[in-house]
């Protein structure tokens, strides 16, 4: 049977301490590099093994990062976002959005917030 994908969207504040090799993740997105259709937000594309983010355990691939140390990541060029992380200091506070797949049901309207297109 065909199904619908629904998502539970939650937000979380994650405080990371920069490790010897940095924060330990990769990002995609930005106004000049839209990774998700009609969304220029910044997304986590890779968590580095044994890096600060991996050891903390809360940040996940696919998470959208909304802010860094209280600074909004909306409408930033990709490289400007990269530079913001690199200059964020030793203690880094991330506001992130997790999207969790919660169920498969009968076919219907696309789940709210589904970025697929």
């Amino acid at each position: 049977m065909n199904g619908r994908v629904d998502y539970l969207v939650t937000e979380e504040e994650i405080n990371l301490t920069r490790g010897p090799s940095g924060l330990g993740f990769n990002i995609v997105g930005g106004t000049d590099q839209q990774y998700v259709s009609n969304d220029s937000g910044i997304y986590v594309s890779r968590i580095k093994e044994n890096g600060a983010a991996a050891l903390d355990g809360r940040l996940q691939e696919g998470d959208k990062i909304l802010s860094v140390n209280g600074q909004d990541l909306k409408n930033l060029l990709h490289q400007d976002a990269v530079d913001l992380f690199r200059n964020a200091g030793y203690a880094v506070s991330l506001r992130v959005q997790h999207r969790l797949q919660v169920q498969n049901g009968p076919i219907g309207h696309r789940g709210e917030g589904d970025p697929s297109g």
């Epitope: 990769n26 990002i27 995609v28 590099q33 594309s45 093994e49 490289q79």
Partner: nanobody
Framework: DVQLVESGGGSVQAGGSLRLSCTAS????????MAWFRQAPGKEREFVAA??????YYADSVTGRFTISRDNAKNTVYLQMNSLKPEDTAVYYC?????????????????????WGQGTQVTVS
């Protein structure tokens, strides 16, 4: 997963040129950081060049002789190798990772890359 296929290797005289190509699968190729590494017999794999959203990076040993470029429409990254030397003889590997690292060190660490090609042999005599 991302598949990488290299081509363009071969044998050339010292001072000659070759162009390597690496074609990747995936619909978001423009977001990938792409790199070339090489491994000579009995030696460790070493960084050659990389290209990310922010620009290109080169090992000191190839700066001024090699040029990395990409064609996002063709999902392909190139390594133009000029003024080749016998010490450039190696198997050349293409590598990829999705996105840009937020960390400030360079892209020369093989552990930075999740996807690897099978390699193409370059021999300079």
């Amino acid at each position: 997963d991302v598949q990488l296929v290299e081509s363009g290797g071969g044998s050339v005289q010292a001072g000659g040129s070759l162009r390597l190509s690496c074609t990747a699968s995936g619909r978001t190729f423009s977001t990938y950081t792409m790199a070339w590494f090489r491994q000579a017999p009995g030696k460790e794999r070493e960084f050659v060049a990389a290209i990310s959203w922010s620009g290109a990076y080169y090992a000191d040993s190839v700066t001024g002789r090699f040029t990395i470029s990409r064609d996002n429409a063709k999902n392909t990254v190139y390594l133009q190798m000029n003024s080749l030397k016998p010490e450039d003889t190696a198997v050349y590997y293409c590598a990829a990772v999705i996105g840009s690292t937020v960390d400030s060190y360079g892209p020369g660490d093989p552990l930075e890359y999740d996807y690897w090609g099978q390699g193409t042999q370059v021999t300079v005599s």
